[in-house]
Protein backbone atom coordinates (compact mmCIF):
# COMPACT_ATOMS: atom_id res chain seq x y z
CA UNK A 1 0.00 0.00 0.00
CA UNK A 2 2.60 2.75 0.88
CA UNK A 3 4.58 1.31 -2.27
CA UNK A 4 1.31 2.21 -4.21
CA UNK A 5 1.24 5.65 -2.61
CA UNK A 6 4.54 6.42 -2.74
CA UNK A 7 4.75 5.56 -6.11
CA UNK A 8 1.69 7.41 -7.30
CA UNK A 9 2.71 10.33 -5.72
CA UNK A 10 5.75 10.20 -7.43
CA UNK A 11 4.16 10.22 -10.83
CA UNK A 12 1.84 13.11 -9.54
CA UNK A 13 4.50 15.20 -8.43
CA UNK A 14 6.27 14.44 -11.79
CA UNK A 15 3.28 15.38 -13.73
CA UNK A 16 3.18 18.68 -11.82
CA UNK A 17 6.56 19.13 -12.20
CA UNK A 18 7.27 18.75 -15.65
CA UNK A 19 3.65 20.42 -16.27
CA UNK A 20 5.73 23.27 -14.82
CA UNK A 21 8.88 22.86 -16.76
CA UNK A 22 6.76 22.75 -20.39
CA UNK A 23 5.05 26.09 -18.98
CA UNK A 24 8.55 27.70 -18.06
CA UNK A 25 9.70 26.93 -21.41
CA UNK A 26 7.20 28.85 -23.40
CA UNK A 27 7.03 31.42 -21.08
CA UNK A 28 7.97 35.05 -22.28
CA UNK A 29 8.94 35.99 -18.59
CA UNK A 30 12.29 34.63 -18.63
CA UNK A 31 13.79 38.21 -17.78
CA UNK A 32 11.64 41.67 -17.43
CA UNK A 33 13.12 44.96 -16.71
CA UNK A 34 14.52 46.29 -14.02
CA UNK A 35 12.25 49.42 -12.58
CA UNK A 36 14.53 49.94 -9.67
CA UNK A 37 15.99 53.11 -11.29
CA UNK A 38 12.37 54.04 -13.24
CA UNK A 39 9.62 52.82 -11.73
CA UNK A 40 6.99 54.76 -13.63
CA UNK A 41 8.06 53.42 -17.03
CA UNK A 42 5.30 53.39 -19.71
CA UNK A 43 7.09 51.06 -21.73
CA UNK A 44 7.97 47.80 -20.10
CA UNK A 45 10.28 44.87 -21.85
CA UNK A 46 10.36 41.21 -21.20
CA UNK A 47 12.11 38.69 -22.58
CA UNK A 48 11.66 34.77 -23.45
CA UNK A 49 13.52 31.82 -24.68
CA UNK A 50 11.90 32.12 -28.17
CA UNK A 51 10.95 35.83 -28.32
CA UNK A 52 10.96 39.44 -26.51
CA UNK A 53 7.91 41.39 -25.88
CA UNK A 54 7.43 45.09 -24.81
CA UNK A 55 4.15 46.30 -23.21
CA UNK A 56 3.30 49.90 -23.34
CA UNK A 57 0.98 51.37 -20.19
CA UNK A 58 -2.37 50.99 -22.97
CA UNK A 59 -1.84 47.44 -22.45
CA UNK A 60 -0.78 46.96 -26.44
CA UNK A 61 1.87 44.26 -26.19
CA UNK A 62 4.08 43.47 -29.24
CA UNK A 63 6.67 40.10 -29.29
CA UNK A 64 8.98 39.64 -32.14
CA UNK A 65 10.37 35.98 -32.40
CA UNK A 66 14.37 35.41 -32.39
CA UNK A 67 14.23 34.96 -36.10
CA UNK A 68 18.09 34.02 -35.75
CA UNK A 69 19.17 30.97 -34.76
CA UNK A 70 23.33 31.49 -35.22
CA UNK A 71 23.32 35.21 -34.16
CA UNK A 72 21.75 34.15 -30.36
CA UNK A 73 24.26 33.73 -27.98
CA UNK A 74 25.66 30.15 -27.17
CA UNK A 75 24.51 30.57 -24.10
CA UNK A 76 20.74 31.19 -24.78
CA UNK A 77 20.68 27.98 -27.17
CA UNK A 78 22.37 25.80 -24.30
CA UNK A 79 19.40 27.30 -21.95
CA UNK A 80 17.03 25.83 -24.77
CA UNK A 81 18.51 22.81 -25.20
CA UNK A 82 18.51 21.68 -21.80
CA UNK A 83 14.81 22.87 -21.23
CA UNK A 84 14.12 20.91 -24.23
CA UNK A 85 16.17 18.24 -23.38
CA UNK A 86 14.41 18.17 -19.90
CA UNK A 87 10.84 17.95 -21.29
CA UNK A 88 11.64 14.97 -23.41
CA UNK A 89 13.15 13.25 -20.88
CA UNK A 90 10.21 13.95 -18.98
CA UNK A 91 7.89 13.09 -21.51
CA UNK A 92 9.26 9.87 -21.97
CA UNK A 93 9.39 9.04 -18.08
CA UNK A 94 5.54 10.36 -17.72
CA UNK A 95 4.84 7.55 -20.52
CA UNK A 96 7.04 4.68 -19.30
CA UNK A 97 5.67 5.52 -15.56
CA UNK A 98 1.98 5.30 -16.43
CA UNK A 99 3.15 1.60 -17.45
CA UNK A 100 5.18 0.98 -14.32
CA UNK A 101 1.96 2.12 -12.03
CA UNK A 102 0.90 -0.66 -9.64
CA UNK A 103 -2.66 0.40 -9.84
CA UNK A 104 -2.49 -0.24 -13.53
CA UNK A 105 -2.46 -3.96 -14.76
CA UNK A 106 -1.21 -4.30 -18.23
CA UNK A 107 -1.68 -7.73 -19.66
CA UNK A 108 0.30 -10.39 -17.07
CA UNK A 109 3.40 -7.87 -16.38
CA UNK A 110 4.82 -8.47 -13.88
CA UNK A 111 6.13 -6.87 -10.48
CA UNK A 112 9.73 -7.27 -11.51
CA UNK A 113 8.80 -5.66 -14.89
CA UNK A 114 6.98 -2.62 -13.23
CA UNK A 115 9.93 -2.17 -11.01
CA UNK A 116 12.56 -1.72 -13.50
CA UNK A 117 10.14 0.66 -15.22
CA UNK A 118 9.35 2.66 -12.11
CA UNK A 119 13.36 2.57 -11.69
CA UNK A 120 13.71 3.75 -15.43
CA UNK A 121 11.26 6.85 -15.18
CA UNK A 122 12.36 7.75 -11.87
CA UNK A 123 15.95 8.27 -13.39
CA UNK A 124 14.12 9.91 -16.13
CA UNK A 125 12.71 12.48 -14.07
CA UNK A 126 15.54 13.09 -11.98
CA UNK A 127 17.84 13.70 -15.31
CA UNK A 128 14.80 15.96 -16.54
CA UNK A 129 14.42 17.95 -13.35
CA UNK A 130 18.05 18.55 -12.88
CA UNK A 131 18.10 19.80 -16.45
CA UNK A 132 15.47 22.33 -16.04
CA UNK A 133 17.34 23.66 -12.78
CA UNK A 134 20.52 23.57 -14.97
CA UNK A 135 18.94 25.54 -17.68
CA UNK A 136 17.19 28.06 -15.01
CA UNK A 137 20.15 28.72 -13.64
CA UNK A 138 22.62 29.28 -16.54
CA UNK A 139 20.31 32.17 -17.50
CA UNK A 140 19.79 33.36 -14.16
CA UNK A 141 23.73 33.55 -13.95
CA UNK A 142 23.67 35.37 -17.66
CA UNK A 143 20.97 37.87 -16.26
CA UNK A 144 23.19 38.58 -12.99
CA UNK A 145 26.63 38.99 -15.33
CA UNK A 146 24.77 41.01 -17.30
CA UNK A 147 22.52 43.36 -14.88
CA UNK A 148 26.46 44.13 -13.11
CA UNK A 149 28.14 44.97 -16.40
CA UNK A 150 25.09 47.14 -17.81
CA UNK A 151 25.12 48.78 -14.15
CA UNK A 152 29.00 49.61 -14.79
CA UNK A 153 27.67 50.89 -18.29
CA UNK A 154 24.89 53.05 -17.09
CA UNK A 155 27.61 55.35 -14.67
CA UNK A 156 29.82 55.47 -17.86
CA UNK A 157 29.84 58.34 -20.65
CA UNK A 158 27.40 60.41 -19.38
CA UNK A 159 29.56 63.77 -19.95
CA UNK A 160 27.20 65.49 -21.85
CA UNK A 161 23.53 66.94 -21.03
CA UNK A 162 22.10 63.72 -22.68
CA UNK A 163 21.57 60.93 -20.61
CA UNK A 164 20.87 57.75 -22.11
CA UNK A 165 18.97 55.21 -19.99
CA UNK A 166 19.97 51.56 -20.24
CA UNK A 167 17.94 48.70 -19.99
CA UNK A 168 18.57 46.45 -17.53
CA UNK A 169 16.89 42.87 -16.79
CA UNK A 170 16.46 41.13 -13.85
CA UNK A 171 14.45 37.43 -12.99
CA UNK A 172 11.22 36.87 -14.85
CA UNK A 173 8.22 34.71 -13.55
CA UNK A 174 9.20 31.83 -15.75
CA UNK A 175 12.60 31.51 -13.48
CA UNK A 176 10.92 31.03 -10.30
CA UNK A 177 8.38 28.40 -11.97
CA UNK A 178 11.48 26.56 -13.60
CA UNK A 179 13.31 26.10 -10.36
CA UNK A 180 9.76 24.81 -8.63
CA UNK A 181 8.92 22.62 -11.36
CA UNK A 182 12.81 21.45 -12.03
CA UNK A 183 12.46 20.50 -7.98
CA UNK A 184 9.41 18.81 -8.04
CA UNK A 185 10.28 16.70 -10.87
CA UNK A 186 13.22 15.79 -9.06
CA UNK A 187 11.31 14.91 -6.06
CA UNK A 188 8.66 12.78 -8.03
CA UNK A 189 11.74 10.90 -9.73
CA UNK A 190 13.45 10.12 -6.06
CA UNK A 191 10.21 8.95 -5.07
CA UNK A 192 9.23 6.73 -8.32
CA UNK A 193 13.17 5.31 -7.27
CA UNK A 194 12.07 4.65 -3.91
CA UNK A 195 8.83 3.18 -4.99
CA UNK A 196 10.97 0.63 -7.42
CA UNK A 197 12.69 -0.88 -4.09
CA UNK A 198 9.59 -1.77 -2.70
CA UNK A 199 8.06 -3.36 -5.65
CA UNK A 200 11.09 -5.39 -6.31
CA UNK A 201 10.15 -8.56 -4.68
CA UNK A 202 12.30 -10.40 -2.11
CA UNK A 203 13.86 -13.29 -3.38
CA UNK A 204 15.94 -15.70 -2.22
CA UNK A 205 18.65 -17.41 -4.25
CA UNK A 206 18.43 -21.23 -4.64
CA UNK A 207 21.05 -23.71 -6.92
CA UNK A 208 18.95 -24.82 -8.92
CA UNK A 209 17.70 -28.45 -8.65
CA UNK A 210 17.94 -30.75 -11.28
CA UNK A 211 15.70 -33.52 -11.60
CA UNK A 212 17.01 -36.63 -13.94
CA UNK A 213 14.16 -38.05 -15.75
CA UNK A 214 14.41 -41.04 -18.35
CA UNK A 215 13.17 -39.05 -21.26
CA UNK A 216 13.97 -34.41 -20.96
CA UNK A 217 15.94 -33.23 -17.93
CA UNK A 218 13.41 -30.99 -16.68
CA UNK A 219 14.91 -28.41 -14.31
CA UNK A 220 13.94 -25.69 -12.08
CA UNK A 221 15.78 -22.89 -11.63
CA UNK A 222 14.26 -18.85 -9.94
CA UNK A 223 14.76 -16.21 -12.62
CA UNK A 224 15.51 -18.34 -15.78
CA UNK A 225 12.88 -17.54 -17.70
CA UNK A 226 13.28 -13.77 -19.22
CA UNK A 227 10.38 -11.17 -19.31
CA UNK A 228 9.48 -10.53 -22.88
CA UNK A 229 8.77 -7.31 -21.98
CA UNK A 230 12.94 -6.50 -22.10
CA UNK A 231 12.91 -4.67 -18.84
CA UNK A 232 14.55 -7.82 -16.63
CA UNK A 233 14.00 -11.25 -15.23
CA UNK A 234 10.56 -12.68 -14.33
CA UNK A 235 11.42 -13.65 -11.04
CA UNK A 236 8.79 -16.37 -10.72
CA UNK A 237 9.82 -19.70 -11.27
CA UNK A 238 9.03 -21.14 -14.38
CA UNK A 239 9.82 -24.50 -15.80
CA UNK A 240 12.32 -24.41 -18.50
CA UNK A 241 12.39 -27.47 -21.39
CA UNK A 242 15.66 -28.22 -22.28
CA UNK A 243 16.56 -30.59 -24.70
CA UNK A 244 19.20 -32.75 -23.22
CA UNK A 245 20.17 -33.25 -19.65
CA UNK A 246 22.47 -30.62 -18.03
CA UNK A 247 24.92 -30.38 -14.95
CA UNK A 248 24.57 -28.76 -12.04
CA UNK A 249 27.05 -25.91 -12.75
CA UNK A 250 25.01 -25.20 -16.19
CA UNK A 251 21.61 -24.74 -14.71
CA UNK A 252 22.26 -22.35 -11.91
CA UNK A 253 20.71 -19.49 -10.69
CA UNK A 254 22.12 -16.16 -11.07
CA UNK A 255 21.90 -12.88 -8.62
CA UNK A 256 18.50 -10.69 -10.04
CA UNK A 257 19.39 -7.14 -11.25
CA UNK A 258 17.34 -5.91 -7.33
CA UNK A 259 19.79 -7.84 -5.31
CA UNK A 260 20.74 -4.35 -4.37
CA UNK A 261 18.07 -4.08 -0.95
CA UNK B 1 -17.48 58.61 -33.50
CA UNK B 2 -15.83 58.85 -30.74
CA UNK B 3 -16.87 61.68 -28.21
CA UNK B 4 -15.30 63.05 -24.69
CA UNK B 5 -17.14 65.62 -23.00
CA UNK B 6 -15.64 67.18 -19.80
CA UNK B 7 -17.51 69.26 -17.70
CA UNK B 8 -17.22 70.66 -13.82
CA UNK B 9 -14.97 73.83 -14.62
CA UNK B 10 -15.44 77.47 -13.24
CA UNK B 11 -14.44 79.52 -10.59
CA UNK B 12 -12.99 78.36 -7.39
CA UNK B 13 -11.49 79.69 -4.49
CA UNK B 14 -7.56 79.40 -3.74
CA UNK B 15 -7.48 76.28 -1.30
CA UNK B 16 -10.47 74.67 -2.37
CA UNK B 17 -11.54 71.61 -4.56
CA UNK B 18 -13.40 71.01 -7.74
CA UNK B 19 -14.20 67.63 -9.32
CA UNK B 20 -13.82 67.39 -12.75
CA UNK B 21 -15.73 64.68 -15.09
CA UNK B 22 -15.51 63.37 -18.58
CA UNK B 23 -18.25 62.22 -20.23
CA UNK B 24 -17.19 59.42 -22.98
CA UNK B 25 -19.27 57.70 -25.46
CA UNK B 26 -18.57 56.12 -29.03
CA UNK B 27 -16.19 53.74 -27.96
CA UNK B 28 -15.48 50.80 -25.06
CA UNK B 29 -14.84 53.26 -22.47
CA UNK B 30 -13.61 50.14 -20.17
CA UNK B 31 -10.63 48.87 -22.30
CA UNK B 32 -9.10 52.44 -22.81
CA UNK B 33 -6.29 54.45 -20.37
CA UNK B 34 -7.93 57.63 -20.06
CA UNK B 35 -5.64 61.10 -19.65
CA UNK B 36 -6.37 64.61 -18.04
CA UNK B 37 -4.47 67.36 -19.46
CA UNK B 38 -4.23 70.92 -19.00
CA UNK B 39 -3.54 73.92 -20.20
CA UNK B 40 -2.48 77.20 -18.52
CA UNK B 41 -4.09 81.01 -20.46
CA UNK B 42 -1.42 81.27 -23.50
CA UNK B 43 1.00 78.34 -22.25
CA UNK B 44 1.70 74.83 -23.59
CA UNK B 45 0.04 71.47 -22.68
CA UNK B 46 1.03 69.91 -18.70
CA UNK B 47 0.14 66.02 -18.82
CA UNK B 48 -1.57 66.11 -15.44
CA UNK B 49 -2.74 62.34 -14.90
CA UNK B 50 -3.17 58.68 -16.42
CA UNK B 51 -5.52 55.92 -15.25
CA UNK B 52 -5.25 52.73 -16.66
CA UNK B 53 -8.11 50.72 -17.97
CA UNK B 54 -8.28 48.79 -15.28
CA UNK B 55 -7.95 51.96 -12.50
CA UNK B 56 -4.43 50.55 -11.44
CA UNK B 57 -1.88 51.55 -11.93
CA UNK B 58 -2.50 55.39 -11.41
CA UNK B 59 0.04 58.15 -12.36
CA UNK B 60 0.17 61.81 -11.70
CA UNK B 61 2.74 64.87 -12.64
CA UNK B 62 4.60 65.66 -9.71
CA UNK B 63 3.11 69.36 -9.32
CA UNK B 64 -0.58 67.70 -8.43
CA UNK B 65 0.69 64.50 -6.40
CA UNK B 66 -1.17 64.57 -3.41
CA UNK B 67 -3.29 67.00 -4.23
CA UNK B 68 -5.35 65.68 -7.35
CA UNK B 69 -7.12 62.04 -7.85
CA UNK B 70 -7.95 60.27 -11.09
CA UNK B 71 -11.04 57.69 -10.76
CA UNK B 72 -13.20 56.40 -13.29
CA UNK B 73 -16.80 54.51 -13.36
CA UNK B 74 -16.84 51.87 -15.52
CA UNK B 75 -20.33 51.31 -15.86
CA UNK B 76 -21.02 55.00 -16.24
CA UNK B 77 -18.38 55.63 -19.09
CA UNK B 78 -16.99 58.47 -16.78
CA UNK B 79 -13.99 60.00 -15.80
CA UNK B 80 -12.98 61.93 -13.00
CA UNK B 81 -10.60 64.15 -11.81
CA UNK B 82 -10.85 65.57 -7.93
CA UNK B 83 -8.91 68.32 -7.75
CA UNK B 84 -7.81 69.77 -4.02
CA UNK B 85 -5.76 72.69 -2.37
CA UNK B 86 -5.85 74.64 -5.21
CA UNK B 87 -3.82 77.38 -6.05
CA UNK B 88 -3.38 80.01 -8.82
CA UNK B 89 -1.32 77.83 -10.35
CA UNK B 90 -4.02 75.28 -11.76
CA UNK B 91 -5.99 77.54 -13.40
CA UNK B 92 -5.93 76.12 -16.89
CA UNK B 93 -8.47 74.73 -19.48
CA UNK B 94 -8.73 70.65 -18.52
CA UNK B 95 -9.24 68.07 -21.48
CA UNK B 96 -9.44 64.43 -20.74
CA UNK B 97 -8.14 61.91 -23.62
CA UNK B 98 -7.92 59.04 -24.56
CA UNK B 99 -5.23 56.72 -24.35
CA UNK B 100 -4.28 55.90 -27.68
CA UNK B 101 -3.67 51.58 -27.77
CA UNK B 102 0.13 52.09 -29.82
CA UNK B 103 2.21 54.30 -29.03
CA UNK B 104 1.05 55.31 -25.47
CA UNK B 105 -0.04 58.88 -27.28
CA UNK B 106 -3.74 60.52 -27.13
CA UNK B 107 -5.54 59.88 -29.82
CA UNK B 108 -9.36 61.71 -28.94
CA UNK B 109 -9.48 64.83 -26.98
CA UNK B 110 -12.33 66.09 -25.21
CA UNK B 111 -13.24 70.59 -25.90
CA UNK B 112 -12.29 71.14 -22.35
CA UNK B 113 -13.60 73.04 -19.64
CA UNK B 114 -11.94 75.84 -18.10
CA UNK B 115 -11.08 75.88 -14.45
CA UNK B 116 -9.96 79.18 -12.94
CA UNK B 117 -8.47 79.65 -9.12
CA UNK B 118 -8.68 83.14 -7.68
CA UNK B 119 -10.32 84.72 -4.99
CA UNK C 1 11.41 63.73 -15.34
CA UNK C 2 12.38 63.56 -18.98
CA UNK C 3 12.50 67.48 -20.38
CA UNK C 4 11.34 68.34 -23.81
CA UNK C 5 12.90 71.04 -26.03
CA UNK C 6 11.27 72.53 -29.15
CA UNK C 7 12.61 74.85 -31.59
CA UNK C 8 12.28 77.56 -32.79
CA UNK C 9 9.39 78.57 -30.85
CA UNK C 10 8.04 80.18 -33.83
CA UNK C 11 8.30 80.00 -37.27
CA UNK C 12 6.84 82.24 -40.15
CA UNK C 13 6.08 80.40 -43.50
CA UNK C 14 4.27 81.05 -46.74
CA UNK C 15 1.94 78.33 -48.34
CA UNK C 16 3.55 75.44 -49.83
CA UNK C 17 6.86 76.16 -48.22
CA UNK C 18 9.03 73.11 -46.74
CA UNK C 19 9.72 73.55 -42.93
CA UNK C 20 11.11 71.54 -40.35
CA UNK C 21 10.52 71.57 -36.75
CA UNK C 22 12.76 70.19 -34.13
CA UNK C 23 12.59 68.44 -30.82
CA UNK C 24 15.45 67.36 -28.56
CA UNK C 25 14.51 65.61 -25.24
CA UNK C 26 16.99 65.37 -22.09
CA UNK C 27 17.07 61.31 -22.35
CA UNK C 28 16.75 58.97 -24.98
CA UNK C 29 13.70 57.93 -25.83
CA UNK C 30 14.27 54.76 -27.71
CA UNK C 31 13.33 51.39 -26.20
CA UNK C 32 15.83 48.76 -26.73
CA UNK C 33 13.01 46.02 -26.54
CA UNK C 34 11.34 46.92 -29.86
CA UNK C 35 13.79 49.50 -31.32
CA UNK C 36 11.02 51.97 -31.22
CA UNK C 37 10.78 55.53 -30.06
CA UNK C 38 8.48 56.85 -27.89
CA UNK C 39 8.00 60.21 -29.22
CA UNK C 40 4.67 61.92 -30.06
CA UNK C 41 3.80 65.10 -32.16
CA UNK C 42 0.54 66.92 -31.58
CA UNK C 43 -0.84 69.62 -33.64
CA UNK C 44 -3.05 72.73 -31.73
CA UNK C 45 -5.18 74.86 -33.58
CA UNK C 46 -6.04 77.95 -31.55
CA UNK C 47 -9.28 77.73 -29.83
CA UNK C 48 -9.23 73.61 -30.35
CA UNK C 49 -8.12 71.03 -28.44
CA UNK C 50 -4.79 68.98 -29.78
CA UNK C 51 -5.05 66.38 -32.29
CA UNK C 52 -2.34 63.57 -32.60
CA UNK C 53 -0.44 63.54 -35.90
CA UNK C 54 2.53 61.06 -34.99
CA UNK C 55 3.66 58.64 -32.86
CA UNK C 56 6.84 56.05 -32.28
CA UNK C 57 8.29 59.13 -33.53
CA UNK C 58 7.58 58.38 -37.12
CA UNK C 59 4.07 56.57 -37.71
CA UNK C 60 1.19 58.40 -38.94
CA UNK C 61 -2.00 58.45 -36.95
CA UNK C 62 -4.66 57.23 -40.02
CA UNK C 63 -6.19 60.50 -41.46
CA UNK C 64 -3.17 62.73 -40.95
CA UNK C 65 -2.10 64.06 -44.15
CA UNK C 66 1.24 62.50 -46.22
CA UNK C 67 2.82 66.12 -46.10
CA UNK C 68 3.81 66.09 -42.27
CA UNK C 69 6.50 63.30 -41.68
CA UNK C 70 8.51 62.11 -38.17
CA UNK C 71 11.56 61.11 -38.07
CA UNK C 72 14.80 60.65 -35.88
CA UNK C 73 15.95 58.37 -33.04
CA UNK C 74 17.12 58.61 -29.35
CA UNK C 75 17.05 62.18 -28.32
CA UNK C 76 17.02 64.13 -31.26
CA UNK C 77 13.51 64.44 -33.49
CA UNK C 78 12.12 66.40 -36.06
CA UNK C 79 8.67 66.81 -37.50
CA UNK C 80 8.92 67.86 -41.11
CA UNK C 81 5.93 69.34 -43.25
CA UNK C 82 6.68 69.10 -47.20
CA UNK C 83 4.44 71.36 -48.41
CA UNK C 84 3.02 73.64 -45.51
CA UNK C 85 -1.25 74.57 -46.15
CA UNK C 86 -3.51 77.17 -44.84
CA UNK C 87 -5.16 74.72 -42.17
CA UNK C 88 -1.49 73.60 -41.08
CA UNK C 89 -1.02 76.86 -38.88
CA UNK C 90 -1.01 76.02 -35.27
CA UNK C 91 1.15 74.97 -32.32
CA UNK C 92 3.26 72.08 -32.69
CA UNK C 93 4.11 69.82 -29.81
CA UNK C 94 6.43 67.22 -28.93
CA UNK C 95 5.34 64.10 -26.18
CA UNK C 96 7.15 62.11 -24.29
CA UNK C 97 5.54 59.00 -24.11
CA UNK C 98 8.41 56.79 -22.92
CA UNK C 99 7.99 57.11 -19.02
CA UNK C 100 5.88 59.09 -16.44
CA UNK C 101 5.11 62.10 -16.05
CA UNK C 102 4.73 62.02 -19.91
CA UNK C 103 6.29 65.74 -20.56
CA UNK C 104 5.45 68.41 -23.75
CA UNK C 105 7.75 70.55 -25.27
CA UNK C 106 6.80 74.09 -25.43
CA UNK C 107 5.61 74.03 -28.74
CA UNK C 108 6.59 75.39 -32.55
CA UNK C 109 4.01 78.05 -33.08
CA UNK C 110 3.26 78.24 -37.26
CA UNK C 111 2.21 81.87 -38.15
CA UNK C 112 1.55 83.31 -41.56
CA UNK C 113 4.70 85.16 -43.27
Known amino acids: MAVTACQGLGFVVSLIGIAGIIAATCMDQWSTQDLYNNPVTAVFNYQGLWRSCVRESSGFTECRGYFTLLGLPAMLQAVRALMIVGIVLGAIGLLVSIFALKCIRIGSMEDSAKANMTLTSGIMFIVSGLCAIAGVSVFANMLVTNFWMSTANMYTGMGGMVQTVQTRYTFGAALFVGWVAGGLTLIGGVMMCIACRGLAPEETNYKAVSYHASGHSVAYKPGGFKASTGFGSNTKNKKIYDGGARTEDEVQSYPSKHDYV | DVQLVESGGGLVQPGGSRKLSCAAS????????MHWVRQAPEKGLEWVAY????????YFTDTVKGRFTISRDNPKNTLFLQMTSLGSEDTAVYYC????????????WGQGTSVTVSS | DIVMTQSPSSLTVTAGEKVTLTCRSS????????????LTWYQQIPGQPPKLLIY???TRESGVPDRFTGSGSGTYFTLTISSVQAEDLAVYYC?????????FGSGTKLEKK
Open chain 3, 27 to 38: QSLLNSGNRKNY
Open chain 2, 97 to 108: ARSSYYGNSMDY
Open chain 2, 51 to 58: ITSGNSPI
Open chain 3, 56 to 58: WAS
Open chain 3, 95 to 103: QNAYSYPFT
Open chain 2, 26 to 33: GFTFSTFG
